[in-house]
Interface confidence: low
């Protein structure tokens, strides 16, 4: 697996995607964990309803939130409020009795609050509402 | 300190493919984009492609796709441009150039580039 | 693509005198995170470019005081104050907000 990175300002909320196959992982929940070192484990954060017919709706574990559309085959990470301690390697899995199938490795990398530095470069008002994904970690 | 070395110079045939290399020293080669970047005689600074060596993501310039790989490995620290079905026009100095990201404020600029690689393709 | 045109394309300057450099992008260069990635570059004969500005106006770790960046959404200026003989080169402005990133074509800045 590539490594997909998301980029996300400090104090604001950063979407993370993960497309998969809905006919492969079908009757399948989901889950978001967070890589320890390298070589080590990938500590869950949260996972999908219990019921994968409700896993549309949106759980949550602090300020990290998932929800999963089954149909299209989407899994949706929202991290709140983030933060430096936020950045760092995640995976989002696939869950099948005990074993998990990662579906996407995610570097979140988060940007410091603009308005923090008083350059003029950064003071500007965006001109189009893309996605932090789309200038500089395109895939 | 942040050093980039890259390979010699390469003379190449049209049609042929050239690879070069680009080793870096002094920072975490793994966790900062590297790019590509090629300069025709006379002509502006033009960008090709650049890796995420810890994952392994690339980006290509469309002008490019198709033509360019570009590798990382990083056991050795170093990144590879690889330009296949070569014509006169790709020949150029061919520089790689880590791209700055300093926290707090994520420049994006390319703040150490290597020496540079002349290309010749000739017949 | 974003186009980056520079004008001048050449510039003679005196030793001491104020050079100035003009970059304009095709399109806007604010990303949505407020930031404008519009950089500076320094190229001297047979060198390696060399990082000069980063994000319009912050000068790199190393570079004088003599050189100054500022500019906002398409314009962008790069200025030396008071110009010097190891100053001669090549200058370009470059954007990396959005993928490809694209160079100007260069003003070569020589001693009058």
């Known amino acids: 697996h590539n490594t997909t990175v998301f980029q996300g300002v400090e104090g604001q909320s950063l979407q993370v995607s993960c497309p998969y196959d809905s006919m492969k992982h079908w009757g399948r929940r989901k889950a978001w964990c967070r890589q320890l070192g390298e070589k080590g484990p990938c500590q869950r954060v949260v996972s999908t309803h219990n019921l994968w017919l409700l896993s549309f709706l949106r759980r949550r574990n602090g300020s990290t939130a998932i929800t999963d559309d089954t149909l299209g085959g989407t899994l949706t990470i929202t991290l709140r409020n983030l933060q430096p301690h936020d950045a760092g390697f995640y995976q989002c899995q696939s869950l099948h009795g005990s074993e998990a199938d990662t579906l996407r490795k995610v570097l979140v990398e988060v940007l410091a609050d603009p308005l923090d530095h008083r350059d003029a470069g950064d003071l500007w008002v965006p001109g189009e509402s893309e996605s932090f994904e789309d200038a500089h970690v395109e895939h | 300190q942040v050093q980039l070395v890259q390979s010699g110079a390469e003379v190449k045939k049209p049609g042929a493919s050239v690879k070069v290399s680009c080793k870096a020293s002094?920072?975490?080669?793994?966790?900062?984009?590297m790019n590509w970047v090629r300069q025709a005689p006379g002509q502006r600074l033009e960008w090709i492609g650049r890796?995420?060596?810890?994952?392994?993501?690339?980006n290509y310039a469309g002008k490019f796709q198709g033509r360019v790989t570009i590798t990382a490995d990083t056991s050795a620290s170093t990144a590879y441009m690889e330009l296949s079905s070569l014509r006169s026009e790709d020949t150029a100095v061919y520089y790689c150039a880590r791209l700055l990201r300093n926290q707090p404020g994520e420049s994006y600029a390319m703040d150490y580039w290597g020496q540079g690689t002349l290309v010749t393709v000739s017949s | 693509d974003v186009v980056m045109t520079q004008s001048p394309d050449s510039l003679a300057v005196s030793l001491g005198e104020r050079a100035t450099i003009n970059c304009r992008s095709s399109q806007s260069l604010v990303h949505s995170n407020r930031y404008t990635y519009l950089h500076w570059y320094q190229q001297k004969p047979g060198q390696s470019p060399k990082l000069l500005i980063y994000k319009v106006s912050n000068r790199f770790s190393g570079v004088p005081d003599r050189f100054s960046g500022s500019g906002s959404g398409t314009d962008f200026t790069l200025k030396i104050s008071r110009v010097e003989a190891e100053d001669v080169g090549v200058y370009y402005c470059s954007q990396s907000t959005r993928v490809p990133y694209t160079f100007g074509q260069g003003t070569k800045l020589e001693i009058k």
């Open positions: 002094g920072y975490a080669f793994s966790s900062q984009w």
């Open positions: 890796i995420y060596p810890g994952g392994g993501d690339t």
